[in-house]
């Protein structure tokens, strides 16, 4: 189709080489009239459509994304050619940063319902550059945490080194929906609820004498509980003796509950005590069996191919540790009688 009638938007993604970050493009076609995907009169670049991204039909995935090759080849369907780019409804997600993402991206409705819809498309010229500015050492992260129940804030990474006074007007989106009131480079949240978790996008306009473009950054916001003040507790084994049959295989499970920690480095291991000797046993990898907002339960098993007489003289010790401290639980094997 002819893309010369598409409205054009220029975007800049300046990514940090130090961190993983994502990027999104919205198919920001204007809010349609009832039977059309687009208003006939296009919005001027300064106007913000009332609802972003495009909500032109009941099926929000009713848009098609293409990339325009720089060599003038025909448009390429994004889904077929670019595995690191995912279409989610009307949003295009770039999972990895890199200058190779630079280019022209076009979106338009899949279903052309009227002659007016033929030119109903948006062309986004995306320029991707690594961040070179070392002066802003402490720019906000693209992954930010909000502490549940307390006051928090979300900062726009590309503007976090500027004071509020010199910061340009910012347009914020949460999960693709325009946050109409927010215009500053930092969103303050009175009281954090899990509802505040999500993908936030901040846009501002930068201009030179020739043209203007939108600088965009994406922030993944996670809502968390405060770090635990407790060391982990062992849920299993509870008893310090275990009846076993000699010559039979045996699996002893150690299950421990670890409270939430922002920097989480749980330790769960088995070791054996035999008179004065002590050694760690190489056992299968630990696995998380339950994870909630507040805590995580991790399990690690010790497997004996067959229980020997010598095993009855040993103590099998499960050792668990977090940044607060450690806990142990020892198990003595006892031969089953009768």
């Amino acid at each position: 189709f002819n893309i010369s009638g598409c409205s054009t938007k220029k975007l800049l993604w300046t990514y940090s080489t130090r961190s993983e970050e994502e990027f999104v493009l919205f198919c920001d076609l204007p809010e349609p009239q009832k039977s059309h995907f687009c208003h006939r009169n296009r919005l001027s670049p300064k106007q913000v459509p009332e609802h972003l991204p495009f909500m032109g039909s009941n099926d929000l995935s009713d848009v098609q994304w293409y990339q325009q090759p720089s060599n003038g080849d025909p448009l390429e369907d994004i889904r077929k050619s670019y595995p690191h780019i995912i279409q989610d409804k009307c949003t295009l997600h770039f999972l990895t940063p890199g200058v190779n993402n630079s280019g022209s991206y076009i979106c338009r409705p899949k279903m052309i319902k009227s002659p007016y819809d033929v030119a109903c498309c948006v062309k986004m010229i995306l320029e991707v550059k690594p961040q070179t500015n070392a002066s802003c050492e402490y720019s906000a992260s693209h992954k930010q945490d909000l502490l549940l129940g307390s006051t928090g804030s979300i900062s726009c990474p590309s503007l976090s080194c500027q004071s509020d006074a010199q910061s340009p007007a910012v347009t914020w989106y949460k999960n693709g929906k325009l946050l109409s009131v927010e215009r500053s480079n930092r969103i303050v949240v009175d009281e954090v609820y899990d509802y505040h978790q999500g993908t936030y996008v901040c846009d501002y306009t930068q201009s030179d004498t020739v043209s203007s473009w939108t600088v965009r950054a994406v922030v993944q916001v996670r809502t968390i509980v405060g770090d635990t003040k407790l060391k982990p507790d062992i849920l299993d084994p509870v008893e310090d003796t275990l009846e076993v049959e000699l010559g039979k295989p045996l699996t002893i499970s150690c299950k421990a509950r670890f409270g939430f920690e922002r920097v989480f480095n749980p330790v769960i291991k088995w070791y054996i005590k035999d008179s004065d000797l002590e050694w760690e046993v190489s056992v299968p990898e630990a696995k998380s069996i339950k994870s909630t907002l507040k805590d995580e339960i991790i399990e690690r098993n010790i497997i004996l191919e067959k229980v020997t007489q010598r095993d009855l003289r040993r103590k099998f010790v499960c050792f668990v540790q977090n940044s607060i401290g450690n806990t142990t639980q020892s198990v003595q094997l006892k031969e089953k009688r009768g």
């Epitope: 129940g149 009131v181 009175d190 009281e191 954090v192 609820y193 509802y195 505040h196």
Partner: antibody, heavy 119, light 111 residues
Framework: SLEESGGDLVKPGASLTLTCTAS?????????ICWVRQAPGKGLEWIAC????????TYYASWAKGRFTISKTSSTTVTLQMTSLTAADRATYFC?????????????WGPGTLVTVSS | DVVMTQTPASVSEPVGGTVTIKCQAS??????LAWYQQKPGQPPKLLIY???TLASGVPSRFKGSGSGTQFTLTISDLECADAATYYC?????????????FGGGTEVVVK
């Protein structure tokens, strides 16, 4: 507990200020203090909320913007200023406390104060 | 603003029976929904918050369910003391907005 005061009989076009007073806790803690009204024989209608924590943010139902103003006036009082009152504003006005511990729901209500608008 | 639509407006059931009240939100409010009971001349009383969590002291005969836009309050083994008006409320405190709209109410008559 919470207690509302300031309800009165006023003429159409008049202004009135209602006060919500806390006892047993203070608005220095972080709560959403809200005003809700109920016309005789009708349902509950949310008017506005103020966050009593550091941000001091205020929020209004779209119909209440401009004519109603919620403010925290001390560590134990929140007020609701109402202007250009009409017969449609006749209602019992409740002060209510919400917040994180109840998923934003109102766990504490005042008994209400009656506002009557009549010429 | 979020709009809450509550049905039915009134319901009558015998003692020991079951009442189901529905509440629909005009947009997705996840599980940020509360249910209140109000008796004449009294302020409302919180029954359920976060769609399904019972407030302290509320009997387990009251059950809340649902998420997104569709919510239900079920009162089983009806008692005379359950005769009241019940309201749902959106309790969403978002980024830069508060959505605290109430449903229109449901009057429960216990025969």
């Amino acid at each position: 507990s919470l207690e509302e005061s300031g309800g009165d009989l006023v003429k159409p076009g008049a202004s009135l200020t209602l006060t919500c007073t806390a006892s047993g806790f203070s608005f220095s803690s972080n709560y959403y203090i809200c005003w809700v009204r109920q016309a005789p024989g009708k349902g509950l209608e949310w008017i506005a909320c103020i966050y009593t924590g550091s941000t001091g943010s205020t929020y209004y139902a779209s119909w209440a913007k401009g004519r109603f103003t919620i403010s925290k006036t001390s560590s134990t009082t929140v007020t609701l200023q109402m202007t250009s009152l009409t017969a449609a504003d006749r209602a019992t006005y409740f002060c209510a406390r919400g917040g994180y511990s109840y998923g934003g729901a109102v766990s504490l209500w005042g008994p209400g104060t009656l506002v009557t608008v009549s010429s | 603003d979020v709009v809450m639509t509550q049905t039915p407006a009134s319901v009558s059931e015998p003692v020991g029976g079951t009442v189901t009240i529905k509440c629909q939100a005009s947009e997705d409010i996840e599980t940020y929904l509360a249910w209140y009971q109000q008796k004449p001349g009294q302020p409302p009383k919180l029954l359920i918050y976060r769609a399904s969590t019972l407030a302290s002291g509320v009997p387990s005969r009251f059950k809340g369910s649902g998420s997104g836009t569709q919510f239900t309050l079920t009162i089983s083994d009806l008692e005379c003391a359950d005769a009241a008006t019940y309201y749902c409320q959106c309790t969403l405190y978002g980024v830069n907005f508060v959505a605290n709209a109430f449903g229109g109410g449901t009057e429960v008559v216990v025969k």
